[in-house]
């Protein structure tokens, strides 16, 4: 039975052609009687809100690998599972790519709209990793290391909508600790819970951690962005992250409110504004070309927000590669 | 970035003709392309795609009457047994990303089919 | 099989009204809905994609909007040059799919 799902290929994570992880390669799902009861239970697995559609597999570019293999002939959930794993499954005997299933959840936005209230992991790079700090009575905790799991990790990677939780031996640095009052500790999640605060825990603010404790969770973040080239890490040539590759972004529609929601998401104050000239003397980067015109309202916390054409899809050369500079 | 379509006539019934969608500026591994028609005075008729991959997908009404295939510039549609029906104003269009296959936001400018005896 | 049934076919309104199209389809496409304009003798031109997305170029008079089986593009403040006809288009599958667009709107300004 598959020990991951995504979905791959859509306008946002919540969205595309089915794929599940089996023994370390990811396969595709055929959709023979794949239908929304399949979808509720996949999109709920992701955190990706409720159910909206079945669309076709193949809808999706680009298309699954020719190498790649059809996992599973069927799924048949009741629409009640926690993950597509508890459904009932036929092995493959007779499918192709052209009946890959795909899915689509009614909330596209969860890998980037507000968080959760009642969960948040502060000062990392972006809302997917971070300081865990739970709210409790409109206070907000921070959680001890003691009792931690990689399965508390995964119900607060679920509950952000962050996919799966990435195992890191990363400790919270010195300027990361919580100035929290009161915090928590003795997680004992089974990793199937909804929210964290469905797990069990010791009680409130009794315990003997210190900050030193404050638990760090990175999750698998569906989007991650730098800066290359420069002298520190608030200038040089944009780069995203994507399918763990970095590629660089096209300068196709780009201007100042673009810099400015990179600059933000960076947490390196404002746009500089630069030139034309300024921006070229980053150089061409290499690899791929991730983004092309990107549109942004200003208003965004992070680039993914922001508007763009399909991953991948580009009439650019790496002469057009985006250099971005902000105040620091 | 454009796509010309050509191979339009006036052909008789029953008499095979093949479409040819030629592309420049863009790489046909990348994007989908679709066939639409168009019969005089009529709406916007789907014929088929062809995506990225090769995998090809056809109307209900066309399978068996129409064949799609693709070089690395071109997207062939083949009318296997034109009827009068068939007359209408051939276009090719892209595929404008994924998730958004049918949605074309490029197109040629169409090519026109008449078949009468 | 997916039907999309477009109402009115045909619709007239005078410069500086607001036009308003309906795309139903006979079965949920999550919002993989298109719209495009066509004029006569010209090839379609996409306006919408995604249900509610407008394409680059496009005046912010076009509006989409919808989700499930209903769908509609709203024209507001119509102007001379959106006289033309106007076709959604599904994107949500290709089985069993007898046309993937709608019928088709004429719109005419007064």
């Known amino acids: 039975s598959p020990s991951g799902v995504r979905l791959v290929g859509g306008l946002h994570r919540c969205e595309g052609r089915v794929e599940v992880e089996q023994k370390g390669q990811w396969g595709t799902v055929c959709d023979d009687g794949w239908d929304i009861k399949d979808v509720a239970v996949l999109c709920r697995e992701l955190g990706c809100g409720a159910a909206s559609g079945t669309p076709s597999g193949i809808l999706y570019e680009p298309p699954a690998e020719k190498e790649q293999k059809v996992l599973i002939q069927s799924v048949s959930c009741t629409g009640t599972e926690d993950t597509l794993a508890q459904c009932e499954q036929e092995e493959v005997y007779d499918c192709s790519h052209d009946e890959d299933a795909g899915a689509s959840c009614e909330n596209p936005e969860s890998s980037f709209s507000p968080v959760p209230e009642g969960v948040r992991l502060a000062d990392g790079p972006g809302h997917c990793k971070g300081r865990v700090e739970v709210k409790h009575q409109n206070q907000w905790y921070t959680v001890c290391q003691t009792g931690w799991s990689l399965r508390a990790a995964k119900v607060v990677c679920r509950q952000l909508g962050c996919g799966r939780a990435v195992l890191t031996q990363k400790r919270c640095n010195k300027h990361a600790y919580g100035r929290k009052p009161i915090w928590l500790s003795q997680m004992s999640c089974s990793g199937r819970e909804a929210t964290l605060q469905d797990c069990p825990s010791g009680p409130w603010g009794k315990n003997t951690c210190n900050h030193d404790e404050d638990t760090w969770v990175e999750c698998e973040d569906p989007f991650d962005l730098r800066l290359v080239g420069g002298d520190n890490l608030c200038s040089g040539r944009l780069e995203v992250l994507h399918k763990g590759v970095w590629g660089s972004v096209c300068d196709d529609n780009w201007g100042e409110k673009e810099d400015q929601v990179v600059c933000k998401q960076l947490g390196c104050g404002k746009s500089l504004s630069p030139s034309f000239r300024d921006r070229k003397c980053y150089g061409p980067g290499v690899g791929r070309i991730w983004l092309d015109n990107v549109r942004c309202s200003g208003e965004e916390q992070s680039l993914e927000q922001c508007q763009h054409r399909f991953w991948g899809f580009h009439d650019c050369t790496h002469q057009e590669d985006v250099a971005v500079i902000c105040s620091g | 970035q454009s796509l010309e379509e050509s191979g339009g006539r006036l052909v008789t019934p029953g008499t095979p003709l093949t479409l040819t969608c030629t592309v420049s500026?863009?790489?046909?591994?990348?994007?989908?392309m679709s066939w639409v028609r168009q019969a005089p005075g009529k709406g916007l008729e789907w014929i088929g795609i062809?995506?990225?991959?090769?995998s090809i997908f056809y109307a209900t009404w066309a399978n068996g009457r129409f064949t799609i295939s693709k070089t690395s510039t071109t997207v062939d549609l083949k009318i296997t047994s034109p009827t009068t029906e068939d007359t209408a104003t051939y276009f090719c269009?892209?595929?404008?990303?994924?998730?958004?296959?049918?949605?074309?936001?490029?197109w040629g400018q169409g090519t026109l089919v008449t078949v009468s005896s | 099989e997916l039907v999309l049934t477009q109402t009115p076919a045909s619709v007239s309104e005078p410069v500086g009204g607001t036009v308003t199209i309906k795309c139903q389809a006979s079965?949920?496409?999550?919002?993989?809905l298109s719209w495009y304009q066509q004029k006569p003798g010209q090839r379609p031109k996409l306006l919408i994609y995604?249900?509610?997305t407008l394409e680059s170029g496009v005046p912010s008079r076009f509006k989409g909007s919808g989700s499930g089986t209903e769908y509609t593009l709203t024209i507001s403040g119509v102007q001379c040059a959106d006289a033309a006809t106007y076709y959604c288009?599904?994107?949500?599958?290709?089985?069993?799919?007898?046309?993937?667009f709608g019928g088709g709107t004429e719109v005419v300004v007064k």
């Open positions: 995604r249900a509610s």
């Open positions: 288009q599904q994107g949500y599958t290709y089985k069993n799919v007898d046309n993937a």
């Open positions: 500026g863009f790489s046909l591994s990348s994007y989908p």
């Open positions: 269009a892209r595929g404008y990303s994924s998730g958004t296959m049918m949605s074309s936001n490029l």
């Open positions: 062809i995506t990225s991959g090769g």
């Open positions: 079965e949920s496409i999550s919002t993989y």
